[in-house]
């Protein structure tokens, strides 16, 4: 015997109470897919959650965070509090970023500043705690006679015409 | 599916109550959590949400009608009932029974019963 | 409370596409539903949450929902779409069903 609770389209309930009539969902829920024999509870955008779309027959209430916080986690599921740029929030609240890293951003961690000697170029204009470095040419592109233009064309070995 | 249908007295004199039964056919009334509303329409004019109750027994209502208006629910006949004392003229509607789903959609409607207030 | 907008009239021509709207404070995180009324009868839902169609309501018939505007549109108008036109949310605040005040469609 086919199960009649398969033909239940989203939005509705298979109700055993009634021979397997789909039903509407009740208020505060919503079945996001078909044969469902129960709708599921909708979510509430409640305390720093703010409701970006609220709950339908076919799909859950949908929330952000309140200003002053941001969204973590699938579907903002935790609503974590802002800092300013060039800080980072710790279990003691927000705190400036440490001399030598970064932030510029209202969320996330304090990074490091670019070391520019690892890629062989020096620091342009220096990092602060909101902004990173900025690297320029290396020492040696800056020597005197030393130009920014195109390389000079390699050199012909003897006896090579040029192809 | 559920069947709704308004019965009561189509005149009512001034100052007294105007009372309603929705009886609810095809369906349990106090399953699912459905909410069970009344609705009315003044002639020529829009639709005016007055309450609905819920299987609780908890009910709300439109705030310029809370004074006057009480719905109850009566599970044993599958029905609910509107009461909306010390009416006037301004009182005379259609009033419509409905079932309240998912996301505040108002499906089904009763036909809609049209009472008047007159001496 | 919560109180949404509609014009009092839309007249359109058959066979064009007809558009009412429904305004409310930030209508767009809310869920709308659009009812007809012909007449002498009782309302029927044509649209619900936004976009969708009960079972026996044309594809003519569709919702859109965003900012501060929902609309209810209606293509390929024919005479028998004249009617009264509500669009109704639920506001979650106060748990109070709202009506707007009914769009009349007239078609020329």
């Known amino acids: 015997l086919q199960d009649l609770c398969s033909n239940c389209p989203a939005g509705t309930f298979c109700d055993n109470n009634r021979s397997q009539i789909c039903s509407p969902c009740p208020p505060n829920s919503f079945s996001s897919a078909g044969g469902q024999r129960t709708c599921d509870i909708c979510r509430q955008c409640k305390g720093v959650f703010k409701t970006r779309k609220e709950c339908s027959s076919t799909s859950n209430a949908e929330c952000d965070c309140i200003s002053g916080y941001h969204c973590l986690g699938a579907e903002c599921s935790m609503c974590e509090q802002d800092c300013k740029q060039g800080q980072e929030l710790t279990k003691k609240g927000c705190k400036d970023c440490c001399f030598g890293t970064f932030n510029d951003q209202k969320r996330g961690i304090c990074r490091p500043w670019t070391n520019c000697s690892l890629d062989g170029k020096s620091v342009l204009v220096n990092g602060t705690k909101e902004r990173d470095v900025v690297c320029g040419p290396s020492p040696a592109d800056l020597s005197p006679g030393a130009s920014s233009a195109t390389p000079p064309a390699p050199a012909r070995e003897p006896g090579h015409s040029p192809q | 599916q559920e069947q709704l249908q308004e019965s009561g007295p189509g005149l009512v004199k001034p100052s007294q109550t105007l009372s309603l039964t929705c009886t609810v056919s095809g369906g349990s009334i106090n399953s699912q959590g459905y909410y069970w509303s009344w609705i009315r329409q003044h002639p020529g004019k829009g639709l005016e949400w007055i309450g609905y109750?819920?299987?609780?027994?908890?009910?709300y209502y439109n705030p310029s009608l809370e004074r006057r208006v009480a719905i109850s629910l009566d599970t044993s006949k599958n029905q609910f009932s509107l009461n909306l004392n010390s009416v006037t003229v301004a009182d005379t509607a259609v009033y419509y029974c409905?079932?309240?789903?998912?996301?505040?959609?108002?499906?089904?409607w009763g036909q809609g019963t049209l009472v008047t207030v007159s001496s | 409370s919560y109180v949404l907008t509609q014009p009092p009239s839309v007249s359109v021509a058959p066979g064009q596409t007809a558009r009412m709207t429904c305004g409310g404070d930030n209508i767009g995180i809310k869920i709308v539903h659009w009812y007809q009324q012909k007449a002498g009868q009782a309302p029927v839902l044509v649209v619900y949450?936004?976009?969708d169609r009960p079972s026996g309501i044309p594809d003519r018939f569709s919702g859109s929902n965003s900012g501060n505007t929902a609309t209810l549109t209606i293509s390929r108008v024919a005479a028998g779409d004249e009617a009264d036109y509500y669009c109704q949310v639920w506001d979650r605040r106060s748990d109070h069903v709202v009506f707007g005040g009914g769009t009349k469609l007239t078609v020329l």
């Open positions: 949450d936004d976009n």
């Open positions: 409905a079932r309240i789903v998912a996301a505040g959609r108002i499906d089904p």
């Open positions: 109750i819920y299987d609780s027994g908890s009910a």
